[in-house]
């Protein structure tokens, strides 16, 4: 290219279809210059024009020779250029923002623009750069890229951005530019120019000065507040704490709060102060609703479903900001709502949902919602399996007979399609409680009835009931307790009877024991005693309770004594006992010792004893007839333990074992014994019968039984030299080697001769008795032997 010829050819395109090529004019050329532009590849095309640019259709791949001939007043000049697509720049047209709007309540900017894709034939990726600037000084606050695709037609694009600062606080500007990325274009791709700027600003109203107003925010977030004011703002506080001011345009200021703490229920106050005023707002920092926990749906009555849940973590938001709950049933599309004005701390919430006809399975979703978010829990229930019955009411007990009653109660609800399992608690006084389960068909009218048998007559019972469905979910609460006394029945057994002959042998004394309550079946009013022989039956007059003994004058013939107990309903079966005893010649008196509280008696099995055994006992020292108490044991027994509160240690008792056959009793064993042996309480009385120069004969008496306090096992006789009323040691004091002791174990022995003594010497003699319970006290005596002759 010659100097003074066209130079600096540059080609750009905005759509890849047309290239706009321009060059610089040769120096010194004026307005009246014409140009001839020829483009040559395989063919040649020439264009005549009067300006330094030309629009040509985009050239296909390869090199093209461009010749530009300039024709002017003082001659012509020619330049040649080689043009290839790689030398061409793709610069999109300057975009234009169609619309910039704002939602001040959420501090969000909304941007809308057209990509003008209709002028661009090829599918291409576009990168948009969006710039947000704040304040009159246009500080950059956001630069973001946004990707779209050109697809041959004009497309509207939208972009939104939530500002960290309320939009009311300062003017916000937005501008955009773009960059087209085309895979098929080998030239240079460049950014478009920035669009004309658009802005959003707040038209202040007279009221609101601080932004945002009454904002709900997540605990831990950062938030910016500002004060739009014509007055100079002097300070800002959150709660009672000052915050540094950030100066905006004019007198407007902002504060930035980081990691905000949870608010009190009344919110957190944010205030800005001026010389004469305070402007403020309230912020509510809390949490979105936690997932409802332990969601449980059940029914009391198959009419209404109660869904309850625990709200979980406290949101710290109350009143209009509190969590609202909606319970949606998906099969029916029905829902119920709960709006809490106050959020309690951690208590259970509940909603009631009316059951739908012919629907048993419910799919519930519990939606929780507050200004910070939502959460949900779901539960699928077959409601017939989730029945928690009401507490049974109107619980009543009525007699059927002496061993059966009718229980009735009220259980509200329509249970026609299900069965109940009810648990009846039966409690007798001073007895373990019994539980009985009954299955009953559910009814529509809420009234239930059940019969309860196998009870005892004339027994005070306490009943209560609770119910669950057969497909167990929960027991109802227990009903109120009901006390009921069953009616009387005839006594089921005759009294436990015994007989003794009077001490003169002329009268038979009949004894019987009161019937236990479970055999009396009512209040015993009287007893009938009769005696019968082969010839006759003699009845005594009726004996009123509480007398438990009768006396009949009888000869020594054999009679059967019969005792019958009577209550208001009837008589017991008779208890029979023979008056005569079956003789037993070969009886020895045995000794028995107990175990502190009772005494164990054993015997050999005797097949002849067909009715029972009787053990009778009495205090040995008491006069006849000897009867303190008796006990009957079955005929297959071979042992029993006799215990009585009246037994005392150291007291001798007589025990008699009788066997029974055909109502007649035979004395099988006679025993004397102690529940517990003690040491004797007295020493034996003893005397010196004879003395010589070398011996002494001592004689002693029996200790009375009452004072022995156990079976006598022997005597301890101590003797040694010693004088009365001297300081010499007494016989029983320890450390004396010259004391001799004799243990006399033959308890029939009543004398003792002590030999090999010294003459004319004083001896100290001591005698003690002992039982297995211990050694008794001592009795002592001083004796002087005779002089040797």
């Amino acid at each position: 290219q010659k100097k003074g010829a066209p130079h600096d050819l540059k080609c750009v395109t905005n759509n890849l279809q047309v290239w706009n090529c321009s060059w610089k004019a040769p120096s010194g050329t004026g307005r009246g210059t014409d140009y001839e532009v020829c483009i040559e590849n395989r063919s040649r095309s020439c264009y005549q024009l009067e300006k330094t640019s030309i629009k040509i259709p985009a050239l296909s791949h390869g090199d093209y020779e461009i010749t530009i001939n300039s024709l002017h007043d003082f001659g012509s000049s020619t330049s040649k250029f080689t043009l290839n697509e790689q030398n061409v720049s793709l610069i999109p047209d300057t975009p234009e923002i169609l619309n910039l709007s704002a939602d001040f309540s959420t501090s969000t900017l909304y941007l809308k623009w057209n990509d003008r894709g209709s002028v661009f034939p090829h599918r291409s990726n576009v990168i948009w750069e969006i710039k947000v600037l704040r304040k009159e000084s246009m500080e950059l606050v956001k630069l973001v890229t946004h990707n779209t695709t050109l697809n041959g037609k004009d497309t509207l694009h939208h972009w939104s951005w939530a500002s960290d600062m309320p939009l009311e606080c300062a003017i916000h500007f937005v501008e955009i530019r773009c960059y087209i990325d085309n895979l098929h274009f080998s030239g240079l791709e460049e950014w478009s120019d920035w669009s004309p700027v658009k802005n959003i600003s707040w038209i202040p109203d007279s009221q609101t000065k601080v932004f945002p107003q009454d904002k709900v925010i997540l605990v831990g977030s950062d938030i910016t507040f500002c004060c739009v004011s014509q007055e100079k703002v002097l300070s800002a506080l959150i709660g009672h704490t000052n915050c540094p001011l950030i100066h905006l345009d004019g007198e407007n200021v902002a504060i930035k709060i980081r990691n905000i703490s949870v608010s009190a229920s009344s919110g957190t106050n944010v205030v800005f102060t001026t010389e004469d005023n305070i402007f403020g707002t309230v912020i509510f920092a809390g949490y979105p609703p936690d997932t409802p926990q332990q969601l449980n749906c059940e029914t009391h009555d198959l009419k209404e479903i109660i869904c309850s849940w625990n709200p979980g973590r406290v949101t710290a938001l109350v009143g209009p900001r509190a969590t609202s709950y909606t319970l949606v049933e998906s099969f029916s599309g029905k829902y119920v709502r709960l709006k809490r004005a106050e959020a309690p701390t951690n208590e259970s919430y509940q909603l009631l949902f009316q059951m739908l006809p012919n629907q048993e399975i419910y799919n519930f979703t519990l939606n929780a919602h507050n200004p910070l978010g939502r959460s949900q829990s779901t539960i699928l229930v077959n409601i017939t399996e989730k029945v928690y019955p009401h507490t049974p009411t109107s619980f009543k007990v009525k007699d059927i007979n002496s061993t059966a009653v009718k229980l009735s109660w009220h259980l509200p609800g329509n249970f026609a399609k299900i069965n109940f399992l009810c648990e009846i608690e039966i409690k007798k006084s001073n007895s373990v409680q019994e539980q009985r389960n009954v299955t009953i068909k559910g009814v529509e009218n809420s009234s239930y009835l059940v019969a309860l048998d196998k009870l005892n007559p004339y027994t005070l019972y306490t009943f209560r009931i609770r119910c669950s469905t057969e497909t167990f979910w929960k027991w109802s609460k227990w009903s109120n307790k009901k006390q009921h006394l069953t009616t009387e029945a005839s006594p089921s057994k005759g009294p436990d009877t015994w007989r003794e002959w009077s001490s003169d042998g002329k009268n038979l004394i009949i004894y019987w024991k009161p019937l236990p309550i479970n055999e009396a079946n009512g209040k015993i009013l009287s007893y009938n005693v009769s005696c019968s022989s082969d010839e006759e039956t003699q009845s005594l007059s009726e004996i009123p309770d509480p007398q438990h003994k009768a006396e009949i004058r009888l000869d020594k013939n054999d009679y059967i004594i019969s005792v019958v107990a009577k209550n208001s309903v009837g008589s017991s079966p008779p208890s029979k006992i023979a008056s005569m005893e079956i003789p037993n010649d070969d009886l020895k008196i045995e000794q028995v010792v107990g175990m502190g509280k009772g005494i164990l008696l054993t015997w050999h099995y005797d097949p002849n004893m067909t009715c029972d055994y009787v053990i009778k006992w009495c205090n040995s020292s008491r006069s006849e007839p000897c009867l303190m108490d008796w006990r009957k044991v079955p005929s297959n027994s071979t042992e029993t333990v006799i215990e009585s509160d009246e037994f005392r240690p150291g007291i001798r008792y007589n025990f008699f074992l009788y066997g029974c056959r055909n109502q007649g009793y035979q004395l099988l064993r006679s025993m004397i014994g102690y529940i517990e042996e003690l040491a004797p309480i007295v020493a034996p009385n003893f005397t010196v019968e004879d003395t010589s120069a070398d011996s002494i004969l001592v004689k002693w008496e029996d200790i009375p039984v009452e004072e022995l306090r156990g079976f006598l096992r022997g005597y301890l006789f101590y003797f040694g030299k010693g004088e009365r009323d001297t300081s010499k040691m007494r016989v029983l004091e320890s450390g004396r080697s010259d004391i001799k002791v004799k243990n006399i174990t033959d308890i029939s022995q009543k004398t003792l001769r002590i030999a090999d003594l010294q003459g004319k010497t004083s001896y100290h003699l001591v005698l003690r008795a002992y039982t297995d319970g211990g050694v008794g006290p001592e009795k002592s005596m001083y004796v002087v032997t005779k002089e040797n002759s």
Epitope: L234, S235, H240, T241, N242, N269, T273, N277, I278
Partner: antibody
């Protein structure tokens, strides 16, 4: 926990000076405006002076303006009240209190007696 | 300056009583009012701010209401610990000003 401890009170003659101090602990001292409030024996509360959290602004009650100066040293967590030209009517318990607008914590006070 | 007037100056009451104290401002102070409790020989203690906001740790039997120039402090059921003096304070503008106080004493 928040603690404010006043010191420097005592008996002083009219016309003399006294400097009260208030040592703060248990909170970020530099984030709170601070006040002096006084209470004459048997009387109600009277606000005396306030200083901004950063010390940039100070306000005084008309009764002490020109005689008293409030100041703070955030590096030492301490508030001061310089009292000059004391008068008999300045006799009171002087409390230092936290909070530019609302006083949420108070010290136990220090007694200043102005008497000849 | 904004003047604050409290009434009554003394109030006799019994445990369990509902007690109301009134505070009037000489000009509108919006809701910029605080209440303090002071026991003999002790420093004041903040009860309420912004007329009705309960300070943390203060029992819920205390409540505040009002805006503009008329304000009340209510104790729903007076407890033995509540016998003390009560002061209102405006903080709309400097100088901060206190009411003259109300002494609540045992009847």
């Amino acid at each position: 926990q928040v603690q404010l401890v006043e010191s420097g009170g005592g008996v002083v003659q009219p016309g003399r000076s006294l400097r009260l101090s208030c040592a703060a602990s248990g909170f970020t001292f530099s984030s709170y405006g601070m006040n002096w409030v006084r209470q004459a024996p048997g009387k109600g509360l009277e606000w005396v002076a306030v200083i901004w959290f950063d010390g940039s602004i100070k306000y005084y009650a008309d009764s002490v303006k020109g005689r008293f100066t409030i100041s703070r040293d955030n590096s030492k967590n301490t508030l001061y009240l310089q009292m000059n030209s004391l008068r008999a009517e300045d006799t009171a318990i002087y409390y230092c209190a936290r909070g530019q607008l609302v006083q949420d914590f108070w010290g136990r006070g220090t007694l200043v007696t102005v008497s000849s | 300056d904004i003047q604050m007037t409290q009434s009554p100056s003394t109030l006799s009451a019994s445990v369990g009583d509902r007690v109301t104290i009134t505070c009037r401002a000489s000009q509108s102070i919006s809701s910029w009012l605080a209440w303090y409790q002071q026991k003999p020989g002790k420093a004041p203690n903040l009860l309420m701010y912004k007329a009705s906001n309960l300070e943390s740790g203060v029992p819920s039997r205390f409540s505040g209401s009002g805006s503009g120039t008329e304000f009340t402090l209510t104790i729903t059921s007076l407890q033995p610990d509540d016998f003390a003096s009560y002061y209102c304070q405006q903080y709309k503008s400097n100088p901060l000003t206190f009411g003259g106080g109300t002494k609540v004493e045992i009847k």
